[in-house]
């Protein structure tokens, strides 16, 4: 089906900075410290390979990865197919974020990643602490008041939360470009669905209470005949592909070794349990701490609060996939009418969840639109 896997790409063993410089792009690496002590690596590609001479301020574009992923998502293909490099070559100042718990954001001022306390977070905290800290840092560093925000998957989720609950942060976003947006997961066909059958009281028994390693939990739901072929076998044992789904047709299989070596990049069991709660409830709401008493301690109310995307006035452009198992078109259909400032929407009928970051035709289907929309914004 895929042919042989060639572990020939040097980026397999590289970090983000090395991956950027490997392709001849300038790179700056920073550490952003959140209010609650998490240390997040942030990378900057200040300009492209051919436009270093252009003086003056370049529009800032911030790229935020999705669930179980990292900033490498935006630079894992060849430069003409990777959104970060495409934007840099188009004359933009590109910044890549990392969410707490992933490979490049696994440090904290107060807690060791060996401790349970380090992993006591979900996407709530990514929205409440990680995004504001990173965006504030970028704004200060560039001296620009506003930036363009590109989110994929959970990167859109934390954007919806942050920009609807933090008005001063929302003012800093010129436009929100949402790829495979996820708010509710009521209709998801992803195998994340299967986690809803695990009772809350047994979730930590099965998965632990730190980093989420599904081990072989999902094997019981994977058809063995599908997963027995060499290439698919590699995908079937990878949590990112298991949860997001995969489709051979749009992949550049020569880059698969890069995808597999950098993903899954890690998240907490609590975050995966939050997603499981969202599947069960069909609602877009904060983490449920398991009892009215505990919820009161965190939220001053017995139930976790709902996130209200209608309160987000940031202009937003949305791309979703007709074959997306995680960001199901029905859920996207529920989301779109709630967005008060929707400026653009495109559904790509044959796209799945990961096609937005890795498909060979992503430039034609998505990225070129983003580049031209940002350049329109400049005028």
């Amino acid at each position: 089906l895929f042919g042989k896997l060639h572990p020939g790409s040097p980026e397999v063993t590289m970090n983000i900075s090395q991956m950027i410089t490997y392709w001849g792009y300038p790179n700056e690496e920073y550490e952003v410290v959140t209010e609650d002590g998490y240390i997040l690596e942030v990378n900057r590609i200040p300009y492209g390979k051919k436009n270093s001479g252009n003086t003056g301020q370049r529009p800032v574009v911030f790229l935020q990865h999705g669930l179980l992923a990292s900033a490498t998502n935006w630079i894992s293909n060849l430069p003409n197919n990777s959104l970060a490099f495409i934007l840099a070559d188009a004359g933009y100042d590109v910044w890549l974020g990392n969410s707490r718990g992933n490979t490049w954001a696994r440090r904290n001022l107060y807690y060791s990643p060996d401790s349970v306390e380090f992993w006591a977070f979900s996407f709530d905290e990514m929205a409440k602490y990680d995004l504001p800290a990173t965006i504030d840092f970028i704004v200060k560093k560039t001296g620009q008041k506003q930036l363009h925000y590109v989110g994929h998957s959970q990167g859109t989720t934390i954007g919806f939360i942050a920009f609807s609950t933090n008005p001063s942060l929302a003012k800093r976003i010129k436009t929100f470009y949402a790829l495979a947006p996820v708010a509710t997961v009521k209709y998801t066909k992803s195998l994340i669905n299967k986690l809803r059958f695990v009772p809350q009281s047994l979730f930590k028994f099965i998965f632990g209470d730190k980093i989420f390693y599904p081990h072989n939990f999902f094997d019981q739901f994977l058809a063995t005949e599908v997963c027995s072929r060499e290439m698919l076998n590699l995908l079937c044992s990878n949590a990112l592909f298991i949860i997001c789904g995969f489709d051979s047709k749009n992949f550049n299989t020569s880059r698969l070794d890069v995808y597999l070596s950098h993903n899954p990049a890690g998240t907490s069991v609590q975050n995966m349990f939050h997603w499981t709660q969202a599947v069960k409830s069909g609602k877009f709401q904060a983490y449920d701490w398991g009892s009215p008493v505990q919820n009161r301690m965190h939220y001053d109310q017995s139930q976790p609060p709902y996130y209200n995307v209608t309160a987000m006035n940031v202009p937003i452009a949305v791309w979703n996939g007709g074959k997306d198992l995680l960001a199901d078109p029905q859920d996207v259909g529920l989301l779109l009418p709630k967005l008060p400032n929707l400026i653009y929407h495109k559904e790509i009928p044959f796209y799945n969840h990961l096609d937005f970051i890795w498909a060979m035709d992503a430039p034609q289907e998505v990225y070129n639109d983003i580049v031209s929309m940002i350049s329109e914004d400049k005028k």
Epitope: P199, Q200, S201, L202, F205, D209
Partner: nanobody, 119 residues
Framework: QVQLQESGGGLVQAGGSLRLSCTAS????????MGWYRQAPGKQRELVAA???????YYTEFVKGRFTISRDNAKKAVYLQMNNLKSEDTAVYSC?????????????WGQGTQVTVSS
């Protein structure tokens, strides 16, 4: 220190039944969840079934409808009733118990008991 001891394994014909037992000894009064895992030759260890202190249960697809997990809190014991056994159920079955304290989870494993299903 907590020790877990399994018993009840053995050789059985396909379609037959076995009941596994696992008992904890030592100093623990706060066992939250208990469960059974298995490991077949040349394969990874996999979850079979689990039960919480409140009686919530989880079964993997492989065993649903055939196996039943239960526990006796007073005896600090967990049981696995296995019916309609198949040759693919052949494995070493180990029990696991956890104490989910405020500062994280302590977990204990048994040595395992061999279950062989002949066809």
């Amino acid at each position: 220190q907590v020790q877990l001891q399994e018993s009840g394994g053995g050789l059985v014909q396909a379609g037959g039944s076995l009941r596994l037992s696992c008992t904890a000894s030592g100093t623990t009064d706060n066992i939250n969840a208990m469960g059974w895992y298995r490991q077949a030759p040349g394969k990874q260890r996999e979850l079979v079934a689990a039960i919480s202190s409140g009686g919530d249960t989880y079964y993997t697809e492989f065993v649903k409808g055939r196996f039943t997990i239960s526990r006796d809190n007073a005896k600090k014991a967990v049981y696995l009733q296995m019916n309609n056994l198949k040759s693919e159920d052949t494995a070493v079955y180990s029990c696991k118990m956890t104490d989910m304290g405020r500062y994280g989870t302590s977990e204990w494993w048994g040595q395992g008991t061999q279950v062989t299903v002949s066809s």
